[in-house]
Interface confidence: low
């Protein structure tokens, strides 16, 4: 016997209480595929979440994070507090990067400056808490008579908003 539920389109559910009649999803619920026997509850963007896309009968709501937080996870499933560039988030809050480390994001952790000498190069631009060092030619390449390297253009600033 053919399952009549397979005829129910997205945005409806197969209501077994009504002889497999397709009923619209109730308010604040959705079904993104046909043939569903129930509708899923819409995600609610509350607290540190804000709504990026409203829920419809055929698709779930999509959330972003409020200002001062950034999304983690495939569907912005978690919001993590922003820090400033030059800081990292610890259990005790945002802390400045230690000397010799940097973080050029509002998220993530402080990382050691690149060790230019490992690649046989010299430091062209010193590192800061917000920026990695810029490595230049090796000291031998800067001997008298050698053409000096053109300093690189300043690194593009990352976007200011967390998302």
């Amino acid at each position: 016997l053919q399952d009549l539920c397979s005829n129910c389109p997205a945005g409806t559910f197969c209501d077994n209480n009504r002889s497999q009649i397709c009923s619209p999803c109730p308010p604040n619920s959705f079904s993104s595929a046909g043939g569903q026997r129930t509708c899923d509850i819409c995600r609610q963007c509350k607290g540190v979440f804000k709504t990026r896309k409203e829920c419809s009968s055929t698709s779930n709501a999509e959330c972003d994070c409020i200002s001062g937080y950034h999304c983690l996870g495939a569907e912005c499933s978690m919001c993590e507090q922003d820090c400033k560039q030059g800081q990292e988030l610890t259990k005790k809050g945002c802390k400045d990067c230690c000397f010799g480390t940097f973080n050029d994001q509002k998220r993530g952790i402080c990382r050691p400056w690149t060790n230019c000498s490992l690649d046989g190069k010299s430091v062209l631009v010193n590192g800061t808490k917000e920026r990695d060092v810029v490595c230049g030619p090796s000291p031998a390449d800067l001997s008298p008579g050698a053409s000096s390297a053109t300093p690189p253009a300043p690194a593009r600033e990352p976007g200011h908003s967390p998302q």
Partner: antibody
């Protein structure tokens, strides 16, 4: 939020190939982005990462073989001179302390 | 070069059981805790389970537990479900932006 890789195809050894990673639902420019590959039936192999300001860092085995670059909307992986050992599915992934978002991968086949 | 070793290439346990997957690093990971765990099913992309060695990624059941520090790390999956059958990879981060994956451990749920 999603990532999508493109550009994978069949190439002959030595023919440079560029793969592109595009984001939906968030701004790529605010995130560190990684490239990881997986040969058929094998494990994950880390290639490299590019910072939000454009600095790229590579696994030791990948230096010189790959170049990672970015624009405001894409992150690219250039395979400079592919060999048959570079046949794999290539993934881009977001994050620098846990890759919380991955693309579906794009298959690169290197064969003569 | 940094190496992450997942000693067991495969483990199995019954539904409702517990499996423990170990990951050993040849060098101390950055901050002692820059280690992540991923789950990958055939034909699918990897999924982040644990970061910072023990922090559960959002949406991941609390049956998954990461522990360890420095060079020795463990992923424990309790109350095994059929859906947990997959390959699990550890990934360590080191100074100088060096990242390495372990070889993977396949979990079979009987």
């Amino acid at each position: 939020q999603s990532l999508e890789e493109s550009g994978g195809r069949l190439v002959t050894p030595g023919t440079p190939l560029t793969l592109t990673c595009t984001a939906s639902g968030f701004s790529l420019s605010n995130y560190y982005m990684n490239w990881v590959r997986q040969a058929p039936g094998k494990g994950l192999e880390y290639i490299g990462i590019i910072s939000s300001s454009g600095s790229a860092y590579y696994a030791s085995w990948a230096k010189g073989r790959f170049t990672i670059s970015r624009t405001s909307t894409t992150v690219d992986l250039r395979i400079t001179s592919p060999t048959t050992e570079d046949t794999a599915t290539y993934f881009c992934a977001r994050g620098d302390y846990g890759m919380d978002l991955w693309g579906q991968g794009t298959l690169v086949t290197v064969s003569s | 070069a940094q190496v992450l070793t997942q000693t067991a290439s495969s483990v199995s346990a019954p539904v409702g059981g517990t499996v423990t997957i170990s990951c050993q690093s040849s060098q101390t990971v950055y901050n002692n805790n820059l280690l992540s765990w991923y789950q990958q099913k055939p034909g699918q992309r990897p999924k982040l389970l644990i970061y910072y060695a023990s922090t559960l990624a959002f949406g991941v059941p609390s049956r998954f537990k990461g522990s360890g520090s420095g060079t020795e790390f463990t992923l424990t999956i309790s109350d095994l479900e059929c859906d947990d059958a997959a390959t699990y990879f550890c990934q360590g981060g080191y100074s100088g932006w060096i990242y390495v994956f372990g070889g993977g451990t396949e979990v079979e749920v009987k």
